[in-house]
């Protein structure tokens, strides 16, 4: 018969052959041949596999370093990563949680809408037009432009979201 | 290497009052928000106060407010927190922290305590 060209799902081609995937927790030792299965090992403690596979070596489960702020949230198993999660107060940098911080900060053109909590983070928002902020923060909301009639100047330079407006002085030369 | 270093905490009196100092090294302190957080005895941390870059902008929590006064000196890299007529309840270890506020640049913290 003609070697295959594919392969059904969980398994795959190799020296012309389909051979069976390693079911997750478990990685390939050795590709099945003509007369033998696919020889797959479980992987050892703290280490994972989540998918079938034909990987050689297992993947480490990710370490929650307290130094970092991190602790485990959920323990990894033999087809699972560990979880982790900051400390109490302490608030992920990102979904995969590889730091904490004490809060983020809103980036100039956003303000605070909502101060952070021990279980919420900051909320920023977009400064609406007629408001701006040019700091990075954690407090501070958006801030109004400035009204130069009231001044008696006028708008030299326009605001921003990042920006105040410029005053400057009324243009006194009229007809 | 970023390093916050607070002092200034005692044992004080009902009433009584304290000032935390938080001496920054490690990089340029002017133009970085600053907060001081409290965690006391088995609780969370709780954000007391926080002061702009500039310093021409604070915040106080409503616990604090009127009763507790953040400043900063950008030419002795130092951040401080006045605390008046303190109450038992605000007995806890204080922290400072920075923008970006990771973990890993918090300083030790000074343990207040408040009782007669």
């Known amino acids: 018969p003609e070697p295959p060209t594919a392969c059904r799902e969980k398994q795959y081609l190799i020296n012309s052959q389909c051979c069976s995937l390693c079911q997750p927790g478990q990685k390939l030792v050795s590709d099945c041949t003509e007369f033998t299965e696919t020889e797959c090992l479980p992987c050892g403690e703290s280490e994972f596999l989540d998918t079938w596979n034909r990987e050689t070596h297992c993947h480490q489960h990710k370490y929650c370093d307290p130094n970092l702020g991190l602790r485990v949230q959920q323990k990894g198993t033999s087809e699972t990563d560990t979880i982790c999660t900051c400390e109490e107060g302490w608030h992920c940098t990102s979904e995969a949680c590889e730091s904490c911080v004490l809060h983020r900060s809103c980036s100039p053109g956003f303000g605070v809408k909502q101060i952070a909590t021990g279980v919420s983070d900051t909320i920023c928002e977009p400064c609406p037009v007629g408001f701006f902020s040019n700091v990075s923060s954690a407090f501070e909301k958006c801030h109004p432009w400035t009204s130069c009639e009231t001044k008696d100047l006028v708008v030299q330079q326009a605001g921003t979201n990042k920006t105040d407006v410029v005053c400057g002085p009324q243009d006194r030369l009229r007809a | 290497e970023v390093q916050l270093l607070e002092s200034g905490g005692g044992l004080v009196q009902p009433g009584g009052s304290l000032r935390l100092s938080c001496a920054a090294s490690?990089?340029?302190?002017?133009?970085?928000?600053m907060w001081w957080v409290r965690q006391a005895p088995g609780k969370g941390l709780e954000r007391v106060s926080a002061?702009?870059?500039?310093?021409?902008?604070?915040y106080y929590a409503d616990s604090v407010k009127g009763r507790f006064t953040i400043s900063r000196d950008d030419s002795k890299n130092t951040l401080y927190l006045q605390m008046n007529s303190l109450r038992a309840e605000d007995t806890a270890v204080y922290y400072c922290?920075?923008?970006?506020?990771?973990?890993?640049?918090r300083g030790q913290g000074t343990l207040v305590t408040v009782s007669s």
């Open positions: 002061i702009s870059g500039s310093g021409g902008s604070t």
């Open positions: 922290a920075k923008e970006p506020y990771s973990f890993d640049h």
């Open positions: 490690g990089y340029t302190f002017a133009g970085y928000e």
